[in-house]
Interface confidence: medium
C-alpha cells in the first residue's frame, strides 16, 4: 500500500471528511478526471488539481498534528506527478506562486503573451511539424 | 498572422509592456517552457500559465478599451489550448474556480484525495498497463 493512503485516511478523520454528506452535490475532481482519457488532457486537469492541493496544504501549516500526513502526501505527489524530478516540481511551484495582481508580473506576462500563445498548440513543438517543414523545403529545393 | 498577435500588441501598449526594462530579472513563462520538451510535461506547465492569463484577464473585465483584445486572445487560447472543445474548457474553468478556503470544498478535496492520488501516475490510466494486465491474466489462465 502506498504511504499516502494511511496519511490521507488520517486527514479524512481530521476533516470529518468520511461522512456520507461529503458526497452531496457531486464530486470536485473525480467526475472531471473521468471525462479525459488522453494523457495530455489529463495533465491539463491534474495540473490544476495538484496546485489546488498544494494551496490547501499550505493552509495547514499552523497545525503540527497533521504535518507528517501532509508532508508524506506531498512527497508522494512529487513522486507520482513529477516523477521525483525536482526541477519539474520547482518550475511548477514557480508558476503557481506568481501574483496576478503584481504590476511587474502583469507587464512581463503581457510582454511574453505572443510567444506563449505561439507555443500552445501541440503542433508548435512536435518533431512532426519540423520534419514536414524540412521535407517541404527539400521538395521545393529539388524542383 | 493569427488574430491574437495584433490584439496582444494592443495589450502591450496598454500595459506599457514593450519597454526593454520589462525583460529585467528574467522571464516568467518562456524560460520554464524551454525546459520541457515532452508534451505531457508541457501541458502541466501550460495549464498553470493559461489559468494565470485567465485570472489576469478577469481582473480587466471592466475596462472597455481592451475588451475586444482580451476576448480575441481568450478565444484564440480556446482554439489552441483546448482544441475548441467547450467541455474541456468548462472542466478547466471549474477546477480553477474552486475556492481553497471554502469548508465544503476542503472536505470534498480530502474525501477524494486517495482516488486522485491513485490516478496521478501516467501508468494508472494508460491502455498499455491494462493490456499488460490482460496478457498476464491470459497467461495465468492458460498455465
Amino acid at each position: 500500500q502506498d504511504p499516502y493512503v494511511k496519511e490521507a485516511e488520517n486527514l479524512k478523520k481530521y476533516f470529518n471528511a468520511g461522512h456520507s454528506d461529503v458526497a452531496d452535490n457531486g464530486t470536485l475532481f473525480l467526475g472531471i478526471l473521468k471525462n479525459w482519457k488522453e494523457e495530455s488532457d489529463r495533465k491539463i486537469m491534474q495540473s490544476q488539481i495538484v496546485s489546488f492541493y498544494f494551496k490547501l496544504f499550505k493552509n495547514f501549516k499552523d497545525d503540527q498534528s497533521i504535518q507528517k500526513s501532509v508532508e508524506t502526501i506531498k512527497e508522494d505527489m512529487n513522486v507520482k506527478f513529477f516523477n521525483s524530478n525536482k526541477k519539474k516540481r520547482d518550475d511548477f511551484e514557480k508558476l503557481t506562486n506568481y501574483s496576478v495582481t503584481d504590476l511587474n508580473v502583469q507587464r512581463k506576462a503581457i510582454h511574453e503573451l505572443i510567444q506563449v500563445m505561439a507555443e500552445l498548440s501541440p503542433a508548435a513543438k512536435t518533431g512532426k511539424r519540423k520534419r514536414s517543414q524540412m521535407l517541404f523545403r527539400g521538395r521545393r529545393a529539388s524542383q | 498572422q493569427d488574430p491574437y498577435v495584433k490584439e496582444a500588441e494592443n495589450l502591450k501598449k496598454y500595459f506599457n509592456a514593450g519597454h526593454s526594462d520589462v525583460a529585467d530579472n528574467g522571464t516568467l513563462f518562456l524560460g520554464i517552457l524551454k525546459n520541457w520538451k515532452e508534451e505531457s510535461d508541457r501541458k502541466i506547465m501550460q495549464s498553470q500559465i493559461v489559468s494565470f492569463y485567465f485570472k489576469l484577464f478577469k481582473n480587466f473585465k471592466d475596462d472597455q478599451s481592451i475588451q475586444k483584445s482580451v476576448e480575441t486572445i481568450k478565444e484564440d487560447m480556446n482554439v489552441k489550448f483546448f482544441n475548441s472543445n467547450k467541455k474541456k474548457r468548462d472542466d478547466f474553468e471549474k477546477l480553477t474556480n474552486y475556492s481553497v478556503t471554502d469548508l465544503n470544498v476542503q472536505r470534498k478535496a480530502i474525501h477524494e484525495l486517495i482516488q486522485v492520488m491513485a490516478e496521478l501516475s501516467p501508468a494508472a490510466k494508460t491502455g498499455k498497463r491494462k493490456r499488460s494486465q490482460m496478457l498476464f491474466r491470459g497467461r495465468r489462465a492458460s498455465q
Epitope: 481530521y14 490547501l56 493552509n59 499552523d62 503540527q64 498534528s65 | 478556503t101
Partner: nanobody, 113 residues
Framework: QVQLQESGGGLVQPGESLRLSCAAS????????GGWYRQAPGKQRELVAF???????RYIDSVKGRFTISRDNAKTTVYLQMNSLQPEDTAVYYC???????WGQGTQVTVSS
C-alpha cells in the same frame, strides 16, 4: 458558505482584560483545530494562539502567560482570554480554523490609557 463572527473586542486600559469569542454565523461548524490571529495597522496578520485537535495549545512569545485559548466542548466556539493587555496588543483580532476558511470581519481591540 460558513461565516465566522468574532466578538468581545473593545477599548481598555493597559493591564485590563478582555475575552474574545468566535463562532460560525450559520451551519454546523467545528473548530477541530483553530486559532486567533491579529493584524495591527500596517502589519501582516499573525497567528497569536493556536489550539490543536488534541487540545495542545501554542502561543507567540509576546503573549505567553497572558493569553489563553480555549473552546467549548462541542468545539463550535473558540475563545481567547486576554489578561494584562498592553498597548502593543492593539489590533483587529480574527479567529479561523486550520486550514483557513474565509476570514470574518474581526473584532477591534484597542489598549490605550
Amino acid at each position: 458558505q460558513v461565516q465566522l463572527q468574532e466578538s468581545g473586542g473593545g477599548l481598555v486600559q493597559p493591564g485590563e482584560s478582555l475575552r474574545l469569542s468566535c463562532a460560525a454565523s450559520r451551519g454546523i461548524f467545528r473548530f477541530n483545530a483553530g486559532g486567533w490571529y491579529r493584524q495591527a495597522p500596517g502589519k501582516q496578520r499573525e497567528l497569536v494562539a493556536f489550539i490543536g485537535v488534541d487540545n495542545t495549545t501554542r502561543y507567540i512569545d509576546s503573549v505567553k502567560g497572558r493569553f489563553t485559548i480555549s473552546r467549548d466542548n462541542a468545539k463550535t466556539t473558540v475563545y481567547l482570554q486576554m489578561n494584562s493587555l498592553q498597548p502593543e496588543d492593539t489590533a483587529v483580532y480574527y479567529c479561523n480554523k486550520v486550514p483557513y476558511i474565509d476570514w470574518g470581519q474581526g473584532t477591534q481591540v484597542t489598549v490605550s490609557s
